[in-house]
């Protein structure tokens, strides 16, 4: 006899990375039939909804109008059908971001390179942290972690056409207190002789997206939710 | 913007009755869900009991359960909570508190966590004592 039922998918929209001020939607889905859903924030209940009619509706929106340092940290739901009480979904990390100062982000030799030579990223921010991120904007979610007391590395050792994209770095007060973003690094690897554009899997956003910090496009949240659970919301772990 | 004045405390004996109001001025009033949260002498926030903008979804604190009632309408921009079979541990000043104004909620949904809410009023005491 099944105890619990499967957990349901959770997710933030536009982005778990929210600049401050901003509104976020924490998404709980379910399934349909489901008499309460229950999120939790940093292991207490934040907010319940209770969907009518249950049985059409196996997806409800908890809304953060404005987002603070309050607000970020790990976010979990859970739903119920009658009695019977789903597993607990994922934990969520929501990202304050904005906060603060903006780095510097510089790459090494430089922002156009041949495949196969080592290219190195710099995050410099003055203030006081010591734990930097550095994003290639895309389809999905490229993250690494790097410590320093005012500057960090990344080194990307030899890099193909892969490698080609957007680069931002953000400085991290804590696990979901973020700096602003630094100012795109655009990274050229050249090499490909028969197509110099990006990579059809990576593709490059307008310029105005990442005011939003699209990393993960809507429609790939929302189709493929294992996709985002284990992008770069595992950098928080 | 969203104003809240809370009215309606008072001293009260051990068993007896209070209901507590909040007049809450701003158009956006009657969308926004909202909530109860009182601050004991000496002690921090204690959420009490939340409400769904349209009044259909309430949620208790488990120590109000049975005892305390949540409602509102929205004709008149006016939150109430009805108290009785009050106890001295229920003195406490108790606020008035709403979400934020900018996002379009649920009509089933309730927030049971103090930090979710952006509007406080000023606050009402309630003393319980014979």
């Known amino acids: 006899q099944q105890q619990t039922l499967p957990k349901p998918f959770i997710w933030a929209e536009p982005h778990f990375m929210v600049p401050k001020e901003k509104q976020v939607t924490i998404c709980c889905q379910g399934n349909y039939g489901a008499v309460e859903y229950q999120l939790h924030f940093e292991g207490s209940l934040f907010a319940v909804d209770r969907p009518k009619p249950p049985e059409r509706i196996n997806k409800v929106q908890f809304y953060i109008p404005d987002m603070n340092s309050r607000m970020a940290g790990q976010y979990s739901c859970i739903y119920r059908v009658g009695e019977l009480w789903s597993e607990p979904s994922n934990l969520l990390d929501l990202v304050v971001t904005e906060m603060y100062d903006t780095p510097t982000l510089s790459v090494h030799p430089g922002p156009e390179v041949i495949s196969g030579e080592k290219v190195t990223f710099y995050c410099r921010l003055d203030t006081a942290t010591s734990m930097f991120l550095l994003l290639k904007e895309g389809r999905s979610s490229h993250v690494q972690r790097g410590y320093g007391k005012v500057q960090a590395e990344f080194p990307l050792g030899p890099v193909t056409t892969a490698h080609r994209g957007t680069y931002r770095c953000f400085g991290s007060y804590n696990n979901h207190a973020w700096s602003f973003p630094s100012e795109p690094v655009k990274l050229l690897v050249t090499g490909d002789i028969e197509n110099t554009s990006l990579a059809p899997e990576d593709p490059t956003f307008p310029a105005d997206t990442w005011g939003t910090y699209l990393l993960t496009t809507e429609t790939g949240l929302q189709k493929d939710h294992a996709l985002w659970d284990h992008t770069a919301q595992n950098l928080l772990r | 913007e969203v104003q809240l004045v809370e009215s309606g405390g008072g001293l009260v004996q051990p068993g007896g009755s209070l209901r507590l109001s909040c007049a809450a001025s701003?158009?956006?009033?009657?969308?926004?869900?909202m909530a109860w949260v009182r601050q004991a002498p000496g002690k921090g926030l204690e959420w009490v009991s939340a409400?769904?903008?349209?009044?259909?979804?309430?949620y208790y604190a488990d120590s109000m359960k049975g005892r305390f009632t949540i409602s509102r309408d929205n004709s008149k921009n006016t939150l109430y909570l009805q108290m009785n079979s009050l106890r001295a541990e229920d003195t406490a000043v108790y606020y008035c508190?709403?979400?934020?104004?900018?996002?379009?909620?649920?009509?089933?949904?309730?927030?049971?966590?103090?930090?979710?809410?952006?509007?406080w009023g000023q606050g009402t005491l309630v003393t319980v004592s014979s």
């Open positions: 508190a709403a979400v934020g104004d900018s996002a379009p909620y649920s009509a089933t949904i309730v927030y049971t966590d103090a930090r979710a809410y952006a509007y």
């Open positions: 701003g158009r956006t009033f009657s969308r926004l869900p």
């Open positions: 409400i769904s903008w349209s009044g259909g979804s309430t």
